[in-house]
Amino acid sequence: QDPYVKEAENLKKYFNAGDPDVADNGTLFLDILRNWKEESDRKIMQSQIVSFYFKLFKNFKDDQRIQKSVETIKEDINVKFFNSNKKKRDDFEKLTNYSVTDSNVQRKAVHELIQVMAELSPAAKIGKRKRSQMFRGRRASQ
Amino acid sequence: QDPYVKEAENLKKYFNAGDPDVADNGTLFLDILRNWKEESDRKIMQSQIVSFYFKLFKNFKDDQRIQKSVETIKEDINVKFFNSNKKKRDDFEKLTNYSVTDSNVQRKAVHELIQVMAELSPAAKIGKRKRSQMFRGRRASQ
């Protein structure tokens, strides 16, 4: 049994998340995850799910009763989702921590928008000239 | 030239994001995107970046001076990042809109945690027995 299971059960007790009424009105994450089979689609969704859990854990980080459980689960997420790659985790954390109401952050984000957009589709990974031809092709052919 | 370029330039004017000082203290997104070449890693990062821009655009949605620009860019993101797939966009939006301070949402999230964790690594897509063997191997080799 993976280490997170026992700790997740502990969190369930703490949050009364084992009660039958918790399942009312559908799931938060599970139905969405079932919709997406392609690895890249799953990563888009899991990225949001993981950032949700990190925020949730942050809100309860000072509660001694669940501190060990939270730390074990975070460590397991780091192994499973970030492949124990600290740089990947650090980059992810940076992105989740930017404040959308900070005017300097807003200006930077808008400044970078054109380059971010240019890289959004998988086609963006090939060389510039080839890409522009391909995307014209996409615009004209898909 | 892709249609978003002109509209992004308009946003730059609006936010004074063309000023030389905007580049001070490094980039928000571009350096991070340069770090990740694997498609699934890129999707993890782009998922956070796209949700940032959507939040930013939401904050300025009633400003007539940039409304057309924002709508064009959002449409372009939907074509490029979500492949014009509204179901993908809808699932993404649901995930970004959950409130981490809502106690019902918290309980649901903790209730689903074990199953979410079980699916976090790409190995999770193969059969259960095979996965447990493979994951022992992964944990020992990473």
Partner: antibody, heavy 124, light 111 residues
Framework: EVQLVESGGGLVKPGDSLTVSCVAS????????IHWVRQAPGKGLEWVAT????????FYSDSLRGRFTVSRDNANNSVYLHMSSLRGEDTALYYC?????????????????WGRGTLVTVSS | NFMLTQPLSVSGYPGKTIVISCVRS????????VQWFQQRPGSAPAMVIY?????PSGIPDRFSGSVDASSNSASLTISGLKTEDEADYFC??????????FGGGTKLTVL
């Protein structure tokens, strides 16, 4: 009230070209994708092409790519389908259909509003 | 090669319930929305279900839509069948980037 009105159909010879038009009203035209869907006499529905709203990206059915070109004029609430090298099997009723507003996460349904169609007959 | 396969014809008596299936040949049915259209002779298609299970305004609750990932199919159910329901029904979904896909259509006969 949302309305889509197609025009420009008619009888043409094999190998000829033809452009059919669609004029829309009752909604913010530039926000919406527009589809062309055709139906041969007594047959099912076949998607032909789509053009996005403000970005004007074009998407085509694999079987028709190269012969058909979709375009739009947002200032005049109009969409066009230019068809070249026409064949007998292109004979059909061509429908103009409103798609999603992809800039709005609460967009009305895709393919909810249809025109009445314009008939294109390809025959020698 | 993506296909949506429907039965050619379905029939039922007034007041009864019929189900029209729409099987997706490849790709996951759950990864794209499914719509259903009713087409009466001489008329343009009219939507009866959008985004898997939602009804446009004016469509009675006798019409319902569902998606089953295990069979990779969508279904349109019409209960309390009426003579006016006699028509052709088409399912529709997507593949790739905005590629629209229609099923072959099902002729519903009310006996």
């Amino acid at each position: 009230e949302v309305q889509l009105v197609e025009s420009g159909g008619g009888l043409v010879k094999p190998g000829d070209s033809l452009t059919v038009s669609c004029v829309a009203s009752g909604f913010t035209f530039s926000n919406y994708f527009i589809h062309w869907v055709r139906q041969a006499p007594g047959k099912g529905l076949e998607w032909v092409a789509t053009i996005s709203g403000r970005t004007k990206y074009m998407f085509y059915s694999d079987s028709l790519r190269g012969r058909f070109t979709v375009s739009r004029d947002n200032a005049n609430n109009s969409v066009y389908l230019h068809m070249s090298s026409l064949r007998g099997e292109d004979t059909a009723l061509y429908y103009c259909v409103r798609g999603y507003d992809h800039s709005d996460s609460n967009s009305a349904a895709d393919l909810l509003h249809w025109g009445r169609g314009t008939l294109v007959t390809v025959s020698s | 090669n993506f296909m949506l396969t429907q039965p050619l014809s379905v029939s039922g008596y007034p007041g009864k319930t019929i189900v029209i299936s729409c099987v997706r040949s490849s790709g996951s049915v759950a990864s794209h929305y499914v719509q259903w259209f009713q087409q009466r002779p001489g008329s343009a298609p009219a939507m009866v279900i959008y985004e898997d299970s939602h009804r446009p305004s004016g469509i009675p609750d006798r019409f319902s839509g569902s998606v089953d990932a295990s069979s990779n199919s969508a279904s349109l159910t019409i209960s309390g069948l009426k003579t006016e329901d006699e028509a052709d029904y088409f399912c529709q979904s997507y593949y790739g980037n905005n590629q629209v896909l229609f099923g072959g259509g099902t002729k519903l006969t009310v006996l």
